[in-house]
């Protein structure tokens, strides 16, 4: 196969298992010169924007989505994709966020380490203007 | 909706280019778009697909080589194919994977195409 | 290379019987998997995707289940309608492996 954009992963920190309350980022990577990270829940509708995006590695760049206090509703799949101009990438993989009854308080450390890297999550559709990489609408739904 | 043309009766060792031309959707969306054919009375067989945005391509292993996946226009993918042998002879579908589901189901599907090889 | 092994080949059962169709995967694909319908002279029809979620516009009858790296769609109280060939197909494209690869299919005769 032929890959003209390498294929984003996406992370979650402190993991992808997070007490009601608590925080979570998700870490969106890609290579260099990315000028938009979208990360997208469930179906491509779903989704939030950002082009706060960082150099990770001469060779990496990410953008980080941090939810600050997670909700049952949070639960679910998460991807991202990113524009590079002039084009959209495929998907990341998905990665599962659970979201369970805090048993230790908001800091709660019993959470599980969190990214996705193969199928064992999964890439999927893919929905996305190559010229207007910002939230310019696609019947969009923000996540939080 | 995607719609199949350049179905022909050629000679073995032949090549033949099939299009797939998409209306009411954009190929900047992002969509893997997919050639699978299907022998007569057989099953369906995947050849490959093409992400419409990004360009990345995948083709089933037996069809590195003689087959070839490209985006050739905003609105046209085609599947262009070397070295035919009579067990090419199959009806070649286009399908896009799908607008509002994940995992990349192939939610819309061509007509198809005849392609037959024989002397 | 992925492969998905379809069982049955073909089956035949009566109006308002139930049938069980299993595809096996030769390695995990999570729930990159769908199954589609097809009927003679005609493009296949999407039932089911993402292992279990039913395509909209999908009688309610057709189930699709998960169980490690076997897939099961179901058909419940059949219709002479519902006689076609039926495939499932891994959904996954990328660089840890190549999916896209159909099972043999399994034709439904209904008596």
């Known amino acids: 196969q032929e890959e003209d954009l390498p294929r984003p992963s996406i992370s979650a920190e402190p993991g992808t298992v997070i007490p009601l309350g608590s925080h979570v980022t998700f870490v969106c990577r890609g290579p260099v010169g990315v000028q938009t990270f979208r990360l997208e829940r469930d179906s491509r509708s779903t989704y939030n924007d950002t082009e706060d995006v960082s150099q990770a590695s001469p060779s990496e760049s990410e953008a980080r989505f941090r939810i600050d206090s997670v909700r049952e509703g949070n639960a679910g799949l998460y991807r991202c994709i990113y524009y590079k101009p002039p084009k959209w990438s495929e998907q990341s993989d998905y990665l599962e966020l659970l979201v369970k009854e805090s048993s230790g308080g908001p800091d709660s450390p019993d959470t599980e380490p969190g990214s996705s890297a193969g199928p064992t999550q999964r890439p999927s559709d893919n929905s996305h203007n190559e010229h207007a990489p910002a939230s310019q609408g696609l019947k969009a739904e923000h996540l939080y | 909706s995607v719609k199949e043309s350049g179905g022909d009766l050629v000679k073995p060792g032949a090549s033949l280019t099939l299009a797939c031309t998409a209306s009411?959707?954009?190929?900047?969306?992002?969509?893997?778009m997919c050639w699978v054919r299907q022998a007569p009375g057989k099953g369906l067989e995947w050849i490959g697909c093409?992400?419409?945005?990004?360009?990345?391509i995948y083709y089933a292993s037996w069809a590195k080589g003689r087959f070839t996946i490209s985006k050739t226009s905003s609105t046209m993918v085609t599947l262009q194919m070397s070295s035919l042998t009579a067990a090419d002879t199959a009806t070649y579908f286009c399908?896009?994977?799908?607008?509002?589901?994940?995992?990349?189901?192939?939610?819309?599907w061509g007509p198809g195409t005849l392609v037959t090889i024989s002397s | 290379e992925l492969d998905l092994t379809q069982t049955p080949a073909s089956v035949s059962e009566a109006v308002g019987g139930t049938v069980t169709i299993k595809c096996q995967a030769s390695?995990?694909?999570?729930?990159?998997l769908a199954w589609y319908q097809q009927k003679p002279g005609q493009r296949p029809k999407l039932l089911i995707y993402a292992a279990s979620s039913l395509a909209s516009g999908v009688s309610s009858r057709f189930r699709g289940s998960r169980s490690g790296t076997e897939y099961t769609l179901t058909i419940t109280d059949l219709e002479c309608d519902d006689a076609a060939t039926y495939y499932c197909q891994c959904t996954y494209y990328g660089t840890t492996y190549v999916g896209g690869a159909f099972g043999g299919g399994t034709e439904l005769e209904i008596k």
């Open positions: 093409i992400h419409s945005s990004s360009g990345s």
């Open positions: 399908a896009r994977d799908s607008e509002s589901y994940g995992y990349n189901p192939c939610e819309l």
């Open positions: 009411g959707f954009s190929f900047s969306d992002g969509y893997y």
């Open positions: 390695q995990t694909i999570s729930n990159y």
